[in-house]
């Protein structure tokens, strides 16, 4: 594609996208677009929405025009009785469009969720629920006698003003976060992942963070005491540095590790906390990466099968997490 | 999102009118009224007018004469007309939502000269 | 003519309180002047902070306030951050129009 032209936007603003679509640059860097979604045709100056884990499918590399938007390789979700691929856009309800991410399912709100100040115009604002009408609508009580909406005034009800708390929310975004996922590794370091619109423009994002449950050179059977059948969170003798690609820690960690157990069970993190790790490379970059530290570990039979898809909701998720 | 954005020419020749139209998304106009407020460079800003959800109009005294605020509510778009103007009259314009005047257009940049 | 006086500028540091007022020239400004707030940070575009008089919008911070402080309408900033410094404007409804003040430039030192 020959980026080499000035650019030239179709129109000076910002489009308006609908709910539940980025707004992204194009291909050129130029101007900004609604990314085509789910089974969209898309060019490189056209891309596929990015934040849902779509890109744009060529077909064969001869032909580089014209693609179809596809889902990166993603779990299903399942919502409401109904499974949508990754990547799938739909809606639940007439008040909430969903969008299916890795497993995670993650709604924008399609009615406002605006907050309406009194105004000569309006001085007791307030959202009801019409008839026939899907969204709640703000409606001005007049006020009963016109000469005193000063004094008035002064006694309308806050949530009358306001409906729900604003605090409580980002402007018309529905905030929600998954729990982490298990560690990728039963041993070594590994990646826990989730999604998140915990962001300002509420768009679905997939986050990781590293993660070692036990290290693999620990033979943790050695140290389960006589009588006994698990050892839940051994004590490790020395801080330790961890390794990642070729680099290691900054720092020393004093990190506790979830042990094993004799009778099959498998004792996997429980409570978990998220903390930043700088890691120097042999080249001298320092590189700052997010990292589960347990805090608990739990033995249980929920252990994952090696050819169980559906793998125990138990071990997939990470309780407790502070961050 | 609600959004306002004022488009207009940037331009106007002495004693002409200056027509402006406010395009309104994120609200309905039957529903919030809409203010015009505008800037003269290194100034403080000066309320023109407000027509109101259901219509009805105020103007700023000093230009009760000349100014015009409408509404197309199908389009939600609030147009603004300013006739006979002068050198005094440049400046930026700015729509903005009643209601706390919460949200405001970019403003557009009117320059009256021949 | 109606004429609604601002402090021009005022300093403040950083985790500081500072209010400023908004005077009607014919006389005490009460709740049916709708008293607003609207802030314009530098290249931003303006945005109500405040409307009538102490409500505040959902992006508004806490530590802004409105009231009704001695004949005057008063945006009180508490524990104020850098990143309040900006121009605000108040803007008081008389029966029929509103008149602007003529700003406060919020100086937020260090």
């Known amino acids: 594609q020959d980026c080499s032209a000035q650019c030239q936007c179709a129109a000076e603003a910002a489009p308006h996208c609908p709910a539940g679509v980025s707004l992204v640059l194009d291909g050129c860097g130029c101007c900004r677009v609604c990314a085509k979604q789910l089974g969209e045709l898309c060019t490189e100056r056209d891309p596929c929405d990015p934040h849902k884990g779509l890109f744009c499918d060529f077909g064969s590399p001869a032909n580089r025009k014209i693609g179809v938007c596809t889902a990166k390789d993603g779990a299903p979700c399942v919502f409401g009785g109904s499974v949508y691929r990754s990547g799938e856009s739909f809606q639940s309800s007439c008040k909430y469009q969903c969008t299916c991410l890795d497993g995670a399912v993650g709604c924008v709100p399609l009615c406002s969720m605006d907050v309406r100040l009194p105004s000569p115009d309006c001085p007791f604002p307030r959202r009801v629920k019409l008839p026939g009408k899907c969204c709640e609508e703000w409606v001005c009580d007049e006020p009963k006698d016109r000469t005193a909406v000063g004094p008035a005034l002064a006694a309308y009800r806050l949530e009358d003003t306001f409906g729900p708390d604003p605090t409580m929310m980002r402007a018309n975004c529905l905030v929600q976060t998954t729990e982490w996922s298990a560690c990728s590794k039963t041993c070594g370091m590994g990646i826990s992942t989730r999604v998140t619109n915990d962001n300002t423009f509420c768009r679905l994002e997939k986050q990781s963070r590293l993660c070692m449950v036990r290290p693999c050179e620990a033979d943790l059977e050695e140290n389960i005491k006589k009588g006994k059948k698990c050892i839940r969170t051994p004590k490790i003798a020395k801080p330790v540095k961890f390794e990642l690609s070729g680099c290691t820690s900054v720092k020393t960690y004093r990190a506790k590790f979830c042990g094993v157990c004799t009778d099959g069970r498998c004792c996997t993190p429980h409570r978990t906390t998220t903390l930043p790790v700088e890691f120097k490379c042999p080249d001298g970059e320092i590189m700052k990466k997010n990292m589960m530290f347990i805090k608990t570990c739990a033995c249980h039979y929920n252990c994952p099968g090696d050819n169980d898809i559906f793998e125990s909701l138990y071990y997939r998720k990470m309780y407790g997490d502070m961050a | 999102e609600v959004q306002l954005q004022e488009s207009g020419p940037g331009l106007v020749k002495p004693s002409q009118t200056l027509s402006l139209t406010c395009t309104v998304s994120?609200?309905?106009?039957?529903?919030?009224?809409v203010h015009w407020i505008r800037q003269h460079p290194g100034k403080g800003l000066e309320w023109l007018g407000v027509i109101w959800r259901r219509g009805g109009t105020d103007y700023n005294a000093a230009f009760m004469s000349r100014l015009t605020i409408s509404k197309d509510t199908s389009k939600n778009q609030v147009s603004f007309k300013l006739s006979s103007v002068t050198a005094a009259d440049t400046a930026v314009y700015y729509c903005a939502r009643d209601g706390g005047f919460d949200y405001w257009g970019q403003g557009t940049t009117v320059t009256v000269s021949s | 003519e109606t004429v609604v006086t601002q402090e021009p500028s005022l300093t403040v540091s950083p985790g500081g309180t500072v209010t400023l007022t908004c005077r009607s020239s014919i006389g005490a400004v009460t709740t049916s002047n709708y008293a607003n707030w609207v802030q314009q940070k530098p290249g931003q575009a303006f945005r109500g902070l405040i409307g009538g008089t102490s409500n505040r919008a959902p992006w508004t911070p806490a530590r802004f306030s409105g009231s009704l402080l001695g004949g005057k309408a008063a945006l009180t900033l508490s524990g104020v951050q850098p990143e309040d410094e900006a121009e605000y404007y108040c803007?008081?409804?008389?029966?029929?129009?509103?008149?602007f003040g003529g700003g406060t430039k919020l100086t937020v030192l260090g």
């Open positions: 994120g609200f309905s106009i039957s529903t919030f009224g």
């Open positions: 803007a008081l409804w008389y029966s029929t129009h509103y008149v």
